[in-house]
């Protein structure tokens, strides 16, 4: 097998053997090493010498194999934009942000830039569960049979109707999507004006 060329090496077809860790330098018509994550180009390559990489300074980073001459500045998660930090910035990774609880990402440009309050789901509905929290606004779906939700809320979940018999009571009024079952003591009639769920 042919010996592997070590950067810098000449490239006539403007492509390099290892696209992730090497790049084509058009001025010199050679392939040079990229700098690993967490570093940047301190000195560019030439036909005599390879790229020299230096570690990113504190509060800066480069996430990928690169031939950047600077590191990117770490940016905090902006609470005014509804963002909160889930992981700090390192030399190899930018600050990881997410939407604050009760918010969703309203503006996305490679990453979330702006969060807004989740819409309330009205009584009788709940927010459809999403794969990723904060990814989109609430999509309210009706409570399934045997469940209810009695508030306007972005996060309240539909709860199962109370089963009166489990508490030694009897059903006074059936539950709906917006209200729980009303239970009563089997020996006492329920006054018509009472709207409580249980009478002991």
């Amino acid at each position: 097998s042919q010996p592997q060329a070590v950067p810098p090496y000449a490239s006539e077809n403007q492509t390099c053997r290892d696209q992730e860790k090497e790049y084509y330098e058009p001025q010199h018509r050679i392939c040079c090493s990229r700098c690993p994550p967490g570093t940047y180009v301190s000195a560019k390559c030439s036909r005599i010498r390879d790229t020299v990489c230096a570690t990113c300074a504190e509060n800066s980073y480069n996430e990928h194999w690169n031939y950047l001459t600077i590191c990117q500045l770490c940016r905090p998660c902006d609470p005014v934009m509804g963002l909160e930090e889930i992981a700090p910035c390192t030399s190899k990774r930018k600050t990881q942000c997410r939407c604050q609880p009760g918010m969703f990402c309203a503006a996305w440009a490679l990453e979330c830039t702006h969060c807004e309050l989740l819409s309330d789901c009205p009584p009788g509905t709940e927010a459809e569960l999403k794969d990723e929290v904060g990814k989109g606004n609430n999509h309210c779906v009706p409570c399934k049979a045997g469940h209810f939700q009695n508030t306007s809320s972005p996060s309240a979940r539909c709860q199962p109707h109370t089963r009166c018999e489990n508490q030694g009571l009897v059903e006074a009024a059936p539950g709906t999507a917006q209200s729980d079952t009303t239970c009563k003591n089997p020996l006492e009639p329920l006054p018509p004006e009472m709207s409580g769920t249980m009478l002991m």
């Epitope: 000449a10 001025q27 010199h28 018509r29 301190s42 000195a43 560019k44 030439s46 036909r47 005599i48 010498r49 390879d50 020299v52 990489c53 230096a54």
Partner: antibody, heavy 121, light 108 residues
């Protein structure tokens, strides 16, 4: 402006190690875009590139001298050094330190004034 | 290793004349990576030209460089008294870096 100054013994015995230091003033040896070089000139002759180094540690030597040469950098003193082992009379020369500004690729834009080293018993 | 041959070995001219110094490489110097230096007796070389034709900082415009491939030229349009020195070419298109043997420019 940046200036370079070589220092070291002017006389070295055969088979011993030649040691020279170059002090950088008016700028930092830790500036990223520079390589720091050694070049020599035999009496009445042309110039010979010995090699160069970057403060981070990347070092390149002339293959004809590679087995005998070692460079080092002391950023705290703003100096870089040359060690040439097993010297013979053929190593008698004026030794220059010089800077490569990588914006000029591999041309030597600043030179020290040179120091004459004689190899003799 | 790329060998550089400079000619003539010595050039005798008068102040005010035009000087043309030649540097020929043993193989093609890709991307025109050639520099020229001036060295006066007892002094370190001084960079005049890099990348074949770019003048270094502070170099008068009477100095110019040209060429490509294997043939390169340093031209001094009107010789001044301080120009009478030794001139070296240097290539950095291949490892190791090499220099020519020099051209001595003498006053006629």
């Amino acid at each position: 402006q940046v200036q370079l100054q070589e220092s070291g013994p002017g006389l070295v015995k055969p088979s011993q190690t030649l040691s020279l230091t170059c002090t950088v003033s008016g700028g930092s040896i830790s500036s990223g875009g520079y390589f720091w070089s050694w070049i020599r000139q035999h009496p009445g002759k042309g110039l010979e590139w010995i090699g160069y180094t970057h403060y981070i540690g990347s070092t390149y030597y002339n293959p004809s001298l590679k087995s005998r040469v070692a460079f080092s950098v002391d950023t705290s003193k703003n100096q870089f050094s040359l060690k040439l082992s097993s010297v013979t009379a053929a190593d008698t020369a004026v030794y220059y330190c010089a800077r490569v500004d990588t914006a000029m690729v591999d041309a030597f834009d600043i030179w020290g004034q040179g120091t004459m080293v004689t190899v003799s018993s | 290793e790329i060998m550089l041959t400079q000619s003539p070995g010595t050039l005798s001219l008068s102040p005010g004349e035009r000087a043309t110094l030649s540097c020929r490489a043993s193989q093609n110097i890709d991307s025109s990576y050639l520099a020229w230096y001036q060295q006066t007796p007892g002094q370190a070389p001084r960079l005049l030209i890099y990348d074949t034709s770019s003048r270094a900082t502070g170099i008068p415009d009477r100095f110019s460089g040209s060429g490509s491939g294997t043939d390169f030229t340093l031209t001094i349009s009107r010789l001044e008294p301080e120009d009478f020195s030794v001139y070296y070419c240097q290539q950095y298109g291949g490892s190791p870096i090499t220099f020519g043997q020099g051209t001595r420019l003498d006053i006629k």
